[in-house]
């Protein structure tokens, strides 16, 4: 379930406007459980932050991770 | 075992206040902020607000601006929703919610774990 209490995180909403590409250090997709599809940016400080898979930026920032 | 406990939902008139309660517990308070989302039926859950435990920054979402104030206690690992002046468009199921580590993007945050939920229906 998208709504269970366990360590599975899901995203009910999406970050706006994209953060500095500087201050991600990596990412994950959240679990095909839940409702939303999602990518989490995690951010020099540790900070979560769920972002749209299917925008522009968020692809080209998953590119960039994976090739740095 | 994680745990989040909600209570105080209930059934007000419209203008009337309820204080909702979020007892937390089997997880370290100052790693996660604590909000509160809200859900009609046949629609997403929202986020109305966040408090983080380790500095105290707060998130309101647009709609509950100055009607709302969310705070800790943090001794209790509890966390309070005081709402004012409630409007029949309140109503929902409210879940309190723990997202890692802080306020800053919420709701944009992945949630970890999800209270039952209490309901709160306002009545015009």
């Known amino acids: 379930s998208p709504y269970s209490s366990d360590t599975t995180p899901c995203c009910f909403a999406y970050i706006a406007r994209p953060l500095p590409r500087a201050h991600i250090k990596e990412y994950f997709y959240t679990s095909g459980k839940c409702s939303n599809p999602a990518v989490v940016f995690v951010t020099r400080k540790n900070r979560q932050v769920c972002a749209n898979p299917e925008k522009k930026w968020v692809r080209e920032y998953i590119n960039s991770l994976e090739m740095s | 075992e994680v745990q989040l406990v909600e209570s105080g939902g209930g059934l007000v008139q419209a203008g009337g206040s309820l204080r909702l309660s979020c007892a937390a517990s089997?997880?370290?308070?100052?790693?996660?902020?604590i909000g509160w989302f809200r859900q009609v039926p046949g629609k997403e859950r929202k986020g109305v607000s966040c408090i983080s435990s380790s500095d105290g920054t707060t998130y309101y979402e647009d709609s509950v601006k100055g009607r709302f104030t969310i705070s800790s206690d943090n001794a209790k690992n509890t966390i309070y929703l005081q709402m004012n002046s409630l409007k029949p468009e309140d109503t929902a199921v409210y879940y309190c919610?723990?997202?890692?580590?802080?306020?800053?993007?919420?709701?944009?945050?992945?949630?970890?774990?999800w209270g039952q939920g209490t309901q709160v229906t306002v009545s015009s």
């Open positions: 089997g997880f370290t308070f100052d790693d996660y902020a």
């Open positions: 919610a723990a997202a890692p580590p802080d306020c800053t993007y919420y709701p944009a945050t992945p949630i970890y774990y």
